[in-house]
Each structure stands twice: as structure tokens, then as C-alpha cells.
């Protein structure tokens, strides 16, 4: 496939990455396929710069990221190892909290107001980020 | 100007199969996702699959799944609808269509007919 | 899936005359609706996105309001060309979903 040299349209370049900050909320699920959809991926937080960088555009809204454990571990969405990676949770975050009386309970993970990440339900209609990376040969599967 | 040319549309008995194509111009066919949507004569719009930019990421409606297929081939800037196993139902006009950044059509083509009858 | 439903299903209208079009959500899809206009044996054209902002082209009489589960198209002042079929879009969620349609004619 082809391969990536320059973001596209509307995104910002950071890092050999590209970044589109949605302004429009959707539930975890559905801005998972928003980004897969523009052949991307919620956003892999892997170094405090980047954390940074991500929170300095999406100011004090709640944002979702790539990260969650609806099927029992921590697992970002693009494979980066949860357990040695970068991590930067609100204190006593994550919780998986069941009192919010929507069911079940916490499995997505978003950016809090001040940046922090916390574990949250995953209908509720965040902002998002996507994120794909410069230089990456692209999906495109062969021709047959 | 962006122009989406379907063909590929004619009569097919009940279990056959057809290939519809879209040809597209006058934007940047590998940047955008594109979609198909029927309807059904004398009924409303019903959105059938997308197929992602690269062509790595698709979804289809549950009516669709598991017998049509989308792809795309960016060399020759056209989008393709592989259908197999026909149903009466499935019957409609397929307009294939860029899908936006915002989730919604912005240009169509004329559409191609497809009948399913025995 | 997301339903959507559309009032009235078909309106008859003149000329001048100010027309509103509801679209409903069966669950909240915050601002992500389009609006299109489908004359008979054409393609839709996109009128409206984002539930309230004006596609590039289209004339300022069309308007979009409403957010979550309730939104209306509104057409001020209704021209010869604006007879047709209008339906609504949700692009919150897989599959995506239209109304049924609203249909103006002339009265």
C-alpha cells in the first residue's frame, strides 16, 4: 500500500503523527469506528509529551481515547502494551464504578477536565480524538 | 467537479450475483470514505455500507451482511458492490456516495438499478 | 439501530409559504443530522449538516435547527424548485439511518 507522508486536511501533525479533534460527542464505540472509518485510531497516549500535546488541544472537556477493558484487561486499541506503557490516571482511577445507575460498570477511558484519564461508561457522547501515524504504509489490501 | 458514475445495475434471478462500480472524479478518491445507499421503489433511503479511505475498514447494514461486499480500488479512483445470494428485497436503486468528515453524503451519483426477480 | 421518524409525511404547500419538517431520534444522536432533498428519479442532494449548518450552494431560505432527539428543516419562503421529497440523516452510529421522507407538492 502507500504510504502516509503528510496529514490530512483539518489535522494536526505532531510528532510523525496525525491528530483530528472531533467537536461533537459520541459514544465510545461509535468515535472508535469514526476513526477507524477515516483510517485512524483513537488516540494511543504512549509519553507524557504527547499526553501534552493532546491535552493542550482538546482543552477541559472530556475526551475519549483509545484505551479500554470491555473484554477484562487494559488494552489500547492499536496493541501498545497497557501494563509498561505511559499511564496517567486521576487518583483512585481507574475504578470500574457501578453507582451511576446507567449499568454495569466503567470501560472506557477518557480525558478528564484537567487531562487526568478516568474510567467511564462507554454510551456516554464524548469528544474524541483520532490518530494515525505518518510514514505508515497504508491498509489498502492487495488487488487480486 | 465531482462527478460518481455508477453502472453495473440490470435484472438478476433470486440467489444470483452482481457487481455494481462507481466511477469517481474531480476530488481525492483514496482521502475519502464512500458509501452505498438503496432505495427501493417507491420507498426511502437505506444506507447499505462504507468502505474507509484505504479500503482497511468496512461495515455494512445487518440486511447486507454476509453476502454483499465493498471495496474500492484507488488506482482506477472506483468503488465496487459485490452481491451475492439476491433477494427480492433487495431490489432498489444503488447510488454509491462520498461520505464527509461529518458522517453525511455530500455528493451522490445518478444511481444504478438493480432488479431481483425471477 | 437509531429510528427515525418524519412529520408530517407529506405537506401541501404555495408558493411564498413558510414549510417546517420534524425529524425525531429514537435516542439521543446529539447534532450529527443531515437534511436532503430528493427530486423524482435523481440522486438526494446534502441541504444540511451537523443538524443546523448550510451545505456549500444550497440557498439561505433552508434552515436547520435542534439537537438530541428533535430537530426541524424549515424553508422560508418556498420557491417552484423546492417541490420534493426531504429526509433526515442520522451519522451518530453504525448503521447509519434515514427518515422516511416528507414529500411537498403544490397546493
Known amino acids: 500500500g502507500s504510504e502516509r507522508t503528510c496529514c490530512p486536511v483539518n489535522w494536526v501533525e505532531h510528532e510523525r503523527s496525525c491528530y483530528w479533534f472531533s467537536r461533537s460527542g459520541k459514544a465510545w464505540a461509535d468515535a472508535d469506528n469514526y476513526c477507524r472509518l477515516e483510517d485512524a485510531h483513537l488516540v494511543v497516549v504512549t509519553s507524557w509529551e504527547e499526553q501534552k500535546f493532546v491535552q493542550h488541544h482538546i482543552g477541559p472537556v472530556n475526551t475519549w481515547m483509545g484505551l479500554h477493558d470491555q473484554n477484562g484487561p487494559w488494552k489500547w486499541v492499536d496493541g501498545t502494551d497497557y501494563e509498561t506503557g505511559f499511564k496517567n490516571w486521576r487518583p483512585e482511577q481507574p475504578d470500574d464504578w457501578y453507582g451511576h445507575g446507567l449499568g454495569g460498570g466503567e470501560d472506557c477511558a477518557h480525558f478528564t477536565d484537567d487531562g487526568r484519564w478516568n474510567d467511564d461508561v462507554c454510551q456516554r457522547p464524548y469528544r474524541w480524538v483520532c490518530e494515525t501515524e505518518l510514514d505508515k504504509a497504508s491498509q489498502e489490501p492487495p488487488l487480486l | 467537479e465531482v462527478q460518481l458514475l455508477e453502472s453495473g445495475g440490470g435484472l438478476v434471478q433470486p440467489g444470483g450475483s452482481l457487481r455494481l462500480s462507481c466511477a469517481a472524479s474531480?476530488?481525492?478518491?483514496?482521502?475519502?470514505?464512500m458509501s452505498w445507499v438503496r432505495q427501493a421503489p417507491g420507498k426511502g433511503l437505506e444506507w447499505v455500507s462504507v468502505?474507509?479511505?484505504?479500503?482497511?475498514?468496512?461495515f455494512y447494514a445487518d440486511s447486507v451482511k454476509g453476502r454483499f461486499t465493498i471495496s474500492r480500488d484507488n488506482s482506477k479512483t472506483t468503488l465496487y458492490l459485490q452481491m451475492n445470494s439476491l433477494r427480492a428485497e433487495d431490489t432498489a436503486v444503488y447510488y454509491c456516495?462520498?461520505?464527509?468528515?461529518?458522517?453525511?453524503?455530500?455528493?451522490w451519483g445518478q444511481g444504478t438499478l438493480v432488479t431481483v426477480s425471477s | 439501530d437509531i429510528q427515525m421518524t418524519q412529520s408530517p409525511s407529506s405537506v401541501s404547500a404555495s408558493v411564498g409559504d413558510r414549510v417546517s419538517i420534524t425529524c425525531r431520534a429514537s435516542?439521543?444522536?446529539?447534532?450529527?443530522l443531515a437534511w436532503y432533498q430528493q427530486k423524482p428519479g435523481k440522486a438526494p442532494k446534502l441541504l444540511i449538516y451537523?443538524?443546523?449548518s448550510l451545505q456549500s450552494g444550497v440557498p439561505s431560505r433552508f434552515s436547520g435547527s435542534g439537537s438530541g432527539t428533535d430537530f426541524t428543516l424549515t424553508i422560508s419562503s418556498l420557491q417552484p424548485e423546492d417541490f420534493a421529497t426531504y429526509s433526515c440523516?442520522?451519522?451518530?452510529?453504525?448503521?447509519?439511518?434515514f427518515g422516511p421522507g416528507t414529500k411537498v407538492d403544490i397546493k
Open positions: 456516495a462520498k461520505r464527509d468528515w461529518n458522517d453525511v453524503f455530500d455528493y
Open positions: 474531480g476530488f481525492t478518491f483514496s482521502s475519502y470514505a
Open positions: 468502505i474507509s479511505g484505504s479500503g482497511g475498514s468496512t
Open positions: 435516542q439521543d444522536i446529539s447534532n450529527w
Open positions: 451537523a443538524a443546523s
Open positions: 440523516q442520522q451519522g451518530n452510529s453504525f448503521p447509519f439511518t
